[in-house]
Amino acid sequence: NFMYSKTVKRLSKLQEYQQYYPSLTCVMEGKDMEDWSCCPTPWTSFQSSCYFISTVMQSWTKSQNNCSVMGADLVVINTKEEQDFITQNLKINSAYFLGLSDPKGWRHWQWVDQTPYNKNVTFWHSGEPNSPDERCAIINFRSEEWGWNDVHCHVPQKSICKMKKIYI
């Protein structure tokens, strides 16, 4: 009976989310393997988040709006582990917008989701950021490593979206 009611609840939750995401990929987790955590297909998952790499070349603002329509934001990177996971799926000859910008050019960097910008947890390439006119951040591969660079916000780039996992 307990299992039946849990299944019914899950199905109704799945139907609710199906309006927004035609397909979800779910895995069982939790100490009793009774919780399901899901990401939209074909997003990838790491810890409590889902990630989508957009290969559409768009400006930073349009990229953020595009993520927003999908219930996400441009990616906020909190740890080296998270960055290492994300970069496994990136192409080394491409650049991807992050959810990091400095709209006034005052070198006051801010994350799209209002996460405090912590200078100690940043992965700028050597010598970056280097121009007050370059007010948006990308991640790219340079000098044998992945790192961040400041670029013009209006120049079209690929992008990475991030959203919280859906729990059912």
Partner: antibody, heavy 121, light 111 residues
Framework: EVQLVESGGGLVKPGGSLRLSCAAS????????MSWVRQAPGKGLEWVST????????YYPDSVKGRFTISRDNAKNSLYLQMNSLRAEDTAVYYC??????????????WGQGTTVTVSS | EIVLTQSPATLSLSPGERATLSCRAS??????????MHWYQQKPGQAPRLLIY???NLESGIPARFSGSGSETDFTLTISRLEPEDFAVYFC?????????FGGGTKVEIK
């Protein structure tokens, strides 16, 4: 006082080439992105090309891509536009303009007086 | 590319009257509190001159009778009382994404 002075315009046959120059003074040229904007007779404004302050980024509309090349010489405070394979539809007044970044975009705060390019046989 | 449509194409008014010029974008040129539309004035035989940046910010040296407003896709340039020197062509411009684009212009002429 900020000044932008274009030169190099003239009459050229279709398929010909011209090199426009823009001499900048009154500001630290190397700190600013620059653009060329043109205006065909009796028409509106059309952006032609952009170059970033450090020369790392250039951009062109499809209408001139592969034919026009923007460049700059920060030591000489000069902006250039090399125009090859010119067509009748390239006939216009060409302005150089200074870019000012504002939030996620930019605007043009100073413009030169323009130089006229006429493409005709 | 983002297409900017200005209306009306021509505005016939008398000195002292109020002028209201419209610019509509094919998609939003705003992001949160940033409204990324700019306005220029052009007189015959002259280069364009910046009037308004960021939808509502008056450029230094521009008279206070000029004002701008709007967000997302709809923007307005208002001249509260037309002076003889205000009769000219006005262009809107966006650069939130490349390529930067201009509207087709509104000519403000003497009635």
């Amino acid at each position: 006082e900020v000044q932008l002075v274009e030169s190099g315009g003239g009459l050229v046959k279709p398929g010909g080439s011209l090199r426009l120059s823009c001499a900048a003074s009154g500001f630290t040229f190397s700190s600013y992105g620059m653009s060329w904007v043109r205006q065909a007779p009796g028409k509106g404004l059309e952006w032609v090309s952009t170059i970033s302050s450090g020369d790392s980024y250039t951009y062109y509309p499809d209408s001139v891509k592969g034919r026009f090349t923007i460049s700059r010489d920060n030591a000489k405070n000069s902006l250039y536009l090399q125009m090859n394979s010119l067509r009748a539809e390239d006939t216009a007044v060409y302005y150089c303009a200074r870019q000012i970044y504002y939030d996620y975009a930019y605007y043009f705060d100073f413009w030169g007086q323009g130089t006229t390019v006429t493409v005709s046989s | 590319e983002i297409v900017l449509t200005q209306s009306p194409a021509t505005l016939s008014l008398s000195p002292g009257e109020r002028a209201t010029l419209s610019c509509r974008a094919s998609e939003s040129v705003s992001f949160r509190t940033s409204h990324l539309m700019h306005w220029y004035q052009q007189k015959p035989g002259q280069a364009p001159r910046l009037l308004i940046y960021g939808a509502s910010n008056l450029e230094s040296g521009i008279p206070a009778r000029f004002s701008g407003s709007g967000s997302e896709t709809d923007f307005t340039l208002t001249i509260s009382r037309l002076e003889p020197e205000d009769f000219a062509v006005y262009f809107c411009q966006q650069s939130i994404e490349d390529p930067p684009t201009f509207g087709g212009g509104t000519k403000v002429e003497i009635k």
